[in-house]
Interface confidence: low
Amino acid sequence: ALDAAYCFRNVQDNCCLRPLYIDFKRDLGWKWIHEPKGYNANFCAGACPYLWSSDTQHTKVLSLYNTINPEASASPCCVSQDLEPLTILYYIGNTPKIEQLSNMIVKSCKCS
Amino acid sequence: ALDAAYCFRNVQDNCCLRPLYIDFKRDLGWKWIHEPKGYNANFCAGACPYLWSSDTQHTKVLSLYNTINPEASASPCCVSQDLEPLTILYYIGNTPKIEQLSNMIVKSCKCS
């Protein structure tokens, strides 16, 4: 799997999970989240050569097409596969609220 | 939806479905498929600005991060959403075989 266990231990130009820390206020302009101040969101990036963690048959077709027709603009892309939620604390007035924001953390990637 | 009904009627720089005809022999080097000779595979391409057909919460976060930090390499990507199968005819010896190849045709796109 193109997850932290593999990607963070290997120098990989191909599609892989990349570390990304997001500070809510600085990076997103969000003032409303009290805790945490930021989180490890991660992201997916890298090349998608033929058969590199292909998501679907179409992805395989597209990467093969791209290999044979390298000048073509049609090529697969490295995107998130498994995501996890993030628990946040915010306030409505003086009342603290805890909420789980779904699909906030990328855990693994794929070529799609 | 970023499908043919919308994308093929509008000039759209942002993420959208793009037409792509694939000739099995010429474009993929596949000689084994007897019929069809090729098919409209389509593909997804285009920019993923903030809130443009975002797939997940993480995609929204990433596109906002990318807007505020345009020099960053972390940005969402335009990929396939809905896919359909393709029915093909091929031969094993003189015996014709009909098979459905899943996820061969892209019908719509998303930013992920």
Epitope: L28, G29, K31, W32, I92, K97 | Y50, Q57, L64, I68
Partner: antibody
Framework: QVTLRESGPALVKPTQTLTLTCTFS??????????VGWIRQPPGKALEWLAH???????SYSTSLKTRLTISKDTSKNQVVLTMTNMDPVDTATYYC????????????WGQGTLVTVSS | DIQMTQSPSSLSASVGDRVTITCRAS??????LNWYQQKPGKAPKLLIF???SLQSGVPSRFSGSGSGTDFTLTISSLQPEDFATYYC????????FGQGTKVEIK
Amino acid sequence: QVTLRESGPALVKPTQTLTLTCTFSGFSLSTSGMGVGWIRQPPGKALEWLAHIYWNDDKSYSTSLKTRLTISKDTSKNQVVLTMTNMDPVDTATYYCARDFYYSGYFDSWGQGTLVTVSS
Amino acid sequence: DIQMTQSPSSLSASVGDRVTITCRASQDISNYLNWYQQKPGKAPKLLIFGASSLQSGVPSRFSGSGSGTDFTLTISSLQPEDFATYYCQQTNTMNTFGQGTKVEIK
């Protein structure tokens, strides 16, 4: 495709209560962080923010008008309703609803606006 | 409440001119400042958010700068479709709009 549309009476009498409905599509107020706000603009004058409601039912109101305003949402109908009591001719304006995302405060999608005239 | 003061209230300019509009907040609002363009009979359109981030689809001739109390919207080369009224908006505490700047043809 995000769209918002305001609806309500074009004419109200002084002292009456105005009820405006914002019907939207392309997003949901059940999504974490999503908000809808109301803004008005008297003829030839500047924009004035009135009220806001978020996915979690958090509401905020303009300080100068908070005693007259009530904002509510019906998530299942994709609607936000604003009521304004004790209408006065100075409240004659085009009333807009707009979508705000994640408490960022800016309005990225607007309705076309509805003109409300207060006159007897 | 935070007050937003725009200047000038109106200006005349020609196509190709560089136009600068300023907005001053009555107290520190960090970078919680947005700019909108409004044409007659139409709803406002978001141009810049977070003081300097260009909204998707907005031409790059528009730019924003500033932090704290003083902010600027710049149109590097005015185009015919840019003649409109421009509003700043602070979102640091509640919401407040400026009084608007009308950009007219000279």
